[in-house]
Amino acid sequence: QDEDFKASDDLTSISPEKRFKVSISGTEVVVTCPDVFGYDNIKWEKNDNLVEGASNRELSQKEFSEVDDSGYYACYADSIKEKSYLYLRARVCANCIEVN
Amino acid sequence: FKVSVEELEDRVFLSCNTSVLRIEGTMGIQLPHSRTLDLGKRILDPRGIYRCNATEEQSDKAPYMQVYYRMCQNCVELNSATLA
C-alpha cells in the first residue's frame, strides 16, 4: 500500500462519540449515529432526503445494495444545529466473512 | 462548506470549494493547484474524517464528513467446501 495513503495511527483528534459506527454482517449494514445529544429525537437523511420512520440511533438495512444504498448519510437531532455526515460505500455478500 | 466525495476510475477524491482538511484517518495526497484530496484506490478501503478548510468565523459552517469504504477485497465466501 502506498505510504501516502496509509491510515493514520492518530485517531484521537475527534472524540469517539462524534464518529459513526458502521457494522456489516452478511448483507446487513447497520449505521449508528454519533451521540448528537443524549436523549434527543433523531432524524436521518440519505442523499439529502429524509428517511421516513427512522428515529433511532441505529439505521439498519437488512439487504444493503452497493448501488442503491451507498451514498451520503446524515443524522441530526431537533435541537442540534450541526448535522453529522457519513459517505458510505459498501460491498456486501450473503455468505462471506472479511479476513485481515 | 460540505466535503463532496467523487470517484474517478478506481480512485476516491474529496473536494471542497476551499481545501480539504483531514481530521483523522487516511491521509491521501493533496493534488497540486487544486482543492482536491486524493484518498487513493477505493479497493484499499479509505476511511477517515474530513472537513472543508474555513476561516475561524466560518468554521461553524464546515461540518465533519466521515468517509467509510468497505469494498470487500478481503472477503471470503463461506460455502460447504470452505467450511470442510
Epitope: N41, S79, K81, E82 | D60
Partner: antibody, heavy 116, light 107 residues
C-alpha cells in the same frame, strides 16, 4: 400558550424519597424530549435528567444516577422525577423544561429541601 | 469539557442598546439559548436556537451566533430588563451554562 407546572417539592430528611411531577400543556407533549434541571442555593444551574419523546432514551447527570428515575406518561401529558436516597446536596429548586439540548420553555419550579 | 465565557457584568443606559456576549469554541455550530433570571424569580428562556423568541418575549430581545461568539442584544433596554443572563448550549450529553452576566440598567 406553553405551560409547564411542577409539583411535589417538599422538605424531606436525608435518605428520604420524593416524586416530582411536571404537567405540560399548550404543545404536543408526545413529540418532545423533556428535561429536569435544578438550581441550588449557590445559583448554579444543572441538568439533572432528560428523556426522549417516547421514553426509550434517558440521561442522568453523574450526581443522581442510580438514585433518581425520570419517566413520562404521554397520555397524561406528564413527566415525573422519582428521587430516592436524597442527600443534602440535592436541595434545590427543580424545574422541568421542554426540549433536550435546546430547551425553549421552563416551568416555575418546585422547591426540594433535604435537611435533618 | 466545553466552556462558555461571559462577561460578569454589563451596564446599559435606559433605552440604549445592550450587547451580552458568550464565547465558546465553534459555538456557531451549536444552538445557543439565552436565559433571563430576575432576582428571586424563576429562569425564563428569552432566546432559543440562536435567534428565536418564545411566545410573550418582547421584540427588543434578539440573538446572533457565528464563529466563536454568540451575542444577546437588547435594543432599548428597560428597567425591568435588569437581571442575570445565562447562555446555554447542549454539548454531548449535558447542558453547559455560562457563568452569567449581570445587566444593570442605568437611569
Amino acid at each position: 400558550e406553553v405551560q409547564l407546572v411542577e409539583s411535589g417539592g417538599d422538605l424531606v430528611k436525608p435518605a428520604g424519597s420524593l416524586r416530582l411531577s411536571c404537567v405540560a400543556s399548550g404543545f404536543t407533549f408526545s413529540d418532545y424530549s423533556m428535561s429536569w434541571v435544578r438550581q441550588g442555593p449557590e445559583k448554579g444551574l444543572q441538568l439533572v435528567a432528560g428523556m426522549n419523546s417516547d421514553g426509550s432514551t434517558t440521561y442522568y447527570t453523574d450526581a443522581v444516577r442510580g438514585r433518581f428515575t425520570i419517566s413520562r406518561d404521554n397520555a397524561k401529558n406528564t413527566m415525573y422525577l422519582q428521587m430516592n436516597s436524597l442527600r443534602d446536596e440535592d436541595t434545590a429548586i427543580y424545574y422541568c423544561a421542554k426540549g433536550a439540548a435546546a430547551p425553549d420553555y421552563w416551568g416555575q419550579g418546585t422547591l426540594v429541601t433535604v435537611s435533618s | 469539557s466545553y466552556e462558555l465565557t461571559q462577561p460578569p457584568s454589563v451596564n446599559v443606559t435606559l433605552r440604549e442598546t445592550a450587547h451580552i456576549t458568550c464565547g465558546g469554541d465553534r459555538i456557531g455550530s451549536k444552538y445557543v439559548q439565552w436565559i433571563q433570571q430576575i432576582p428571586g424569580q424563576a429562569p425564563v428562556v428569552i432566546i432559543y436556537k440562536d435567534n428565536n423568541r418564545p411566545t410573550g418575549i418582547p421584540e427588543r430581545f434578539s440573538g446572533a451566533n457565528s464563529g466563536n461568539t454568540a451575542t444577546l442584544t437588547i435594543s432599548g433596554a428597560l428597567a425591568e430588563d435588569e437581571a442575570d443572563y445565562y447562555c446555554q448550549v447542549g454539548d454531548n450529553y449535558t447542558w453547559v451554562f455560562g457563568e452569567g452576566t449581570q445587566l444593570t440598567v442605568l437611569r
